[in-house]
Amino acid sequence: RKAVLDCEAMKTNEFPSPCLDSKTKVVMKGQNVSMFCSHKNKSLQITYSLFRRKTHLGTQDGKGEPAIFNLSITEAHESGPYKCKAQVTSCSKYSRDFSFTIVDPVTSPVLNIMVIQTETDRHITLHCLSVNGSLPINYTFFENHVAISPAISKYDREPAEFNLTKKNPGEEEEYRCEAKNRLPNYATYSHPVTMPSTGGDSCPFCLK
């Protein structure tokens, strides 16, 4: 009789579909992730099963707490889709599909500087390119550790460009750029390039 009651409950909102989620949705290969399969009903003893496409990854029992499945994303096919099943006696419901986005981390970008020197000004063009990493890549340019550009999004493998005009400075300035894609908390910086102060023939990047 209990099984019948559980199955009847399934047909109402008392036993809705489970929820499958992960704190990390954008991952890189080799990353460990935790997937949480949870259910609104906190009083029932529930058996949770995790699937990826058409393979079974594991089963856990839980009551009141979500089931936690720990995985390592090492191959492209491991992005998903995943789904979890909540089962009580002979009755079950499935979650919606969940997929990770696998992103290759950006490598350190290379900063190139081109300068056109006039008597009063320096017209500076900064180019920044990261040759590896999943697109799109956001580039930001810095002068003396202060951002001087907005984030420039590049959807193809070409350098980001930023132009600025400066009065001929009296002291040297340091430029660098940052490359960042969808991987959270993962940004790389170029080596700094120092622009010498004016005075004498001290503009190695200048177009004469």
């Epitope: 099963s49 699937f51 990826r52 496409r53 058409k54 393979t55 079974h56 990854l57 594991g58 191959e75 096919h77 099943k85 002979s90 079950s92």
Partner: antibody, heavy 119, light 112 residues
Framework: EVQLVESGGGLVQPGGSLRLSCAAS????????ITWVRQAPGKGLEWIGT???????YYSTWAKGRFTISRDNSKNTVYLQMNSLRAEDTAVYYC?????????????WGQGTLVTVSS | AIQMTQSPSSLSARVGDRVTITCQSS????????LSWYQQKPGKAPKLLIY???RLASGVPSRFSGSGSGTQFTLTISSLQPEDFATYYC????????????FGTGTKVTVL
């Protein structure tokens, strides 16, 4: 070349044991699932059990307890340990590989090895 | 236990005929489409023809097609060729009582 080669079949007495091997080449068992299937003479195909890329094992109801599937990643080989063998276990035993993340879409098969249980 | 029943168990046909084989499962397969079809010739290992109930496996001629969902599935050969005389099996994947697979009973296609 991707292939599976079974070995270890032969004549065994009722009540005896036998271990079949399935040597995989051209791919890694840490990515693919291997399934054992058997076919008695003149009969249909019968699923025995499966070991997936995570090492999880699954068995047919009738095979549970008597048959055990294991693998050795260093040798890229899967094993089928068969105990308490009976005359009705006489069959050709196949191992087969599934698609990635699809345990039972069996697209690569071994040639099969014959097991005869008789006194 | 899950039952996978194929019908007919055998059939005779001519080259050029349209042939239909059905597979009836006692329970719904996982995802409603975890079903594949295999061809086996005497003394040989089976060969995958169809997966996901209706998707053609690599290298399989387009005269083979599959359909169905849940518990009822069909394999169709639109125009039977001499090399198609063989035995055909369906294979379902299930998660109702553990992660489980079951073959159909088989259908032997012979020359009329």
């Amino acid at each position: 070349e991707v292939q599976l080669v079974e070995s270890g079949g032969g004549l065994v007495q009722p009540g005896g044991s036998l271990r079949l091997s399935c040597a995989a080449s051209g791919f890694s068992l840490t990515i693919y699932t291997i399934t054992w299937v058997r076919q008695a003479p003149g009969k249909g195909l019968e699923w025995i059990g499966t070991i997936n890329s995570y090492g999880n094992t699954y068995y047919s109801t009738w095979a549970k307890g008597r048959f055990t599937i294991s693998r050795d990643n260093s040798k890229n080989t899967v094993y089928l340990q068969m105990n308490s063998l009976r005359a009705e276990d006489t069959a050709v035993y196949y191992c087969a590989r599934g698609y990635v993340d699809s345990d039972w879409y069996l697209n690569i098969w071994g040639q099969g090895t014959l097991v005869t249980v008789s006194s | 236990a899950i039952q996978m029943t194929q019908s007919p168990s055998s059939l005779s046909a001519r080259v050029g005929d349209r042939v239909t084989i059905t597979c009836q499962s006692s329970e719904s397969v996982y995802d409603n489409n975890y079903l594949s079809w295999y061809q086996q010739k005497p003394g040989k290992a089976p060969k995958l023809l169809i997966y996901d109930a209706s998707r053609l496996a690599s290298g399989v001629p387009s005269r083979f097609s599959g359909s169905g969902s849940g518990t009822q599935f069909t394999l169709t050969i639109s125009s039977l060729q001499p090399e198609d005389f063989a035995t055909y099996y369906c294979l379902g994947g299930y998660d109702s009582s553990g992660w489980y697979a079951a073959f159909g009973t088989g259908t032997k296609v012979t020359v009329l």
